[in-house]
Amino acid sequence: LYFSRDAYWEKLYVDQAAGTPLLYVHALRDAPEEVPSFRLGQHLYGTYRTRLHENNWICIQEDTGLLYLNRSLDHSSWEKLSVRNRGFPLLTVYLKVFLSPTSLREGECQWPGCARVYFSFFNTSFPACSSLKPRELCFPETRPSFRIRENRPPGTFHQFRLLPVQFLCPNISVAYRLLEGEGLPFRCAPDSLEVSTRWALDREQREKYELVAVCTVHAGAREEVVMVPFPVTVYDEDDSAPTFPAGVDTASAVVEFKRKEDTVVATLRVFDADVVPASGELVRRYTSTLLPGDTWAQQTFRVEHWPNETSVQANGSFVRATVHDYRLVLNRNLSISENRTMQLAVLVNDSDFQGPGAGVLLLHFNVSVLPVSLHLPSTYSLSVSRRARRFAQIGKVCVENCQAFSGINVQYKLHSSGANCSTLGVVTSAEDTSGILFVNDTKALRRPKCAELHYMVVATDQQTSRQAQAQLLVTVEGSYVAEEAGCPLSCAVSKRRLECEECGGLGSPTGRCEWRQGDGKGITRNFSTCSPSTKTCPDGHCDVVETQDINICPQDCLRGSIVGGHEPGEPRGIKAGYGTCNCFPEEEKCFCEPEDIQDPLCDELCR
């Protein structure tokens, strides 16, 4: 048995006569043989669930669910209740109604076995019938909504009449009907005004019924019509077995360059027309098991269950359903030497499904793990300016397909043939497994004998120690111009184009900083700033070279404070800025301010 609502509302007036009917509560059956029996909780409750008093005023007919006054609620009774309401004015009280077979403790009131009945209290006697508006004659102030379980026997779930009005204003005629389309499973009995289901409902066909209740009031010659929404929600049960959309029960996958732990290798989708079990219970009751195969497969793969609610069309309306994605995921990084093919089976069990048929599916994954061999091109040729500053990025080295790698740890090293000409360094970028070449020693760049630099690039897979090698030939171009000692170490200090471009800074490939003119559109990623190279800084990402020194690109790398209009980067730097952004790395501060059109002296004074 279950209540068709979790809450009911009615009005109470001072000195309403004993015997006044108040309202009906309704229970629906889960099985044809069930007979409801209602009982009231012992207490009346007030604001914030305050227990006010034993309920001496309201009774219920156990078999019909009719609540009525068994004694009048007078002023003194009301004041007695008000005193206990923690000092709040007593505007509403409520009672708990239980379905008898359920031996719920009084303290708890949870649908489906308990409903609350709220009474709005009016410190006046019942108004004259002639003063009541049609809306007050027809419907309670709070619009009801109903919940009906699918596949359950049909039954009565509502009674339209406002019983106190019918009892105290017998001369006013009130008629009700339901506006509904053809073939809907509800009827309103013209005599009793009871609303019932005609047949068992199927949530997978329709989940919500947005009906309209029409009330016609006849008072003498006057006729008025009032319409209110009458929503019914159908509650789900696990009556649908999981299925494969379009019958796809097998997925094939190749593991090659993406070998990192947590990589999703393949996904199979399971559809279930139900939305139960609820999300909290779902993973526990909708199980997936990787069936035992060889030990290597068990250690290497795991299955992740990702349920998601979706909408499907049924009979012209949308109903909720669930799609379950089962992802085959790498449990560990795979060595580049690993080479095997296997079939994996996953058993999916909707353990709440009662049939007919089985709530079990078998998913198949065909997986090929291919080995990866390291290759570098035979030779790299690059050029570098003699004016390049320390940490200037001059190029990349990359084993074949390195951009696609994940979970493969390749380290790059440079071996110089000329001991005194070891100008360059290399660092491995975790993002794309490439090696970034940068200027490490500017003194060597200036030596006349270091006009051509010869290196051997060695790429080593850290797990297997497999290697690839390539020649690197670097031509040093241009003439050296001594840097000015007064120039800031960081290009980012400069706030204006002129002062930016007449200085160099750490990370500058040309020996000169570059001005990036912003788009001037409020707080933007494209803010104006001074950079060692606009190719790499700022780009919203503190790369592996930039991490070596905060002076290279504080716009991407600063962990300190940013003053002015900006959006902070994740996890550091400036993601977006207002106007021009400049930085003082040693103070760990950046400033984003409107484009400056004042004269230079003002800027210096304002520093």
Partner: antibody, heavy 119, light 107 residues
Framework: QVQLVESGGGVVQPGRSLRLSCEAS????????MHWVRQAPGKGLDWVST????????YYSDSVKGRFTISRDNSKNTLYLQMNSLRAEDTAVYYC????????????WGQGTLVTVSS | DIQMTQSPSTLSASVGDRVTITCRAS??????LTWYQQKPGKAPKVLIY???TLERGVPSRFSGSGSGTEFTLTISSLQPEDFATYYC?????????FGQGTKLEIK
Amino acid sequence: QVQLVESGGGVVQPGRSLRLSCEASGFTFRNYGMHWVRQAPGKGLDWVSTIYYDGSDEYYSDSVKGRFTISRDNSKNTLYLQMNSLRAEDTAVYYCARDPPSFRYFDYWGQGTLVTVSS
Amino acid sequence: DIQMTQSPSTLSASVGDRVTITCRASQSIRSWLTWYQQKPGKAPKVLIYKASTLERGVPSRFSGSGSGTEFTLTISSLQPEDFATYYCHQYSSYSYTFGQGTKLEIK
């Protein structure tokens, strides 16, 4: 507040060595370039040596090149000047000074330590 | 090396006077010039950097101007505490050089 305190000065014979220290506090030492500047008694200021914030680059005046070595220990917030083959003309008050990477002028100076080279 | 020549070497003036000290560089140093004040037995103190920018905490009677090779330090109204030796300093080249100094005396 920013403080620079020099130590290690004293009287030394020509040809001998001395090591000066400059202890820094009140700022993030590792972020700043540092200098040694000297002043002979009754004379003007004379730049001696410079070291980058990270120790990656050093510069020396011609008069001390090959004899003096500048170094720093960022973990101890200390700047050093190793002075070898000292001469009488190296007699001076030696100051350490701070160089903010964003502005590059010598913005804070220590109170100095006196080195006297005499037989 | 860049030579820095200061003039005059000595300057006698009275409280309330406006005084100007000149510094000339042997080649262009753009605006990379600092002015220091030094009192006997004390370390130099920055007054002006980048030729014309007043150091924080320095009274506004001090001002600097110039760029390239010609620079001036002006004290608009001498105060008793201003009598000291003043040095210019170029930081354009890593061979830093100082002017020989200007001694400002009470007349």
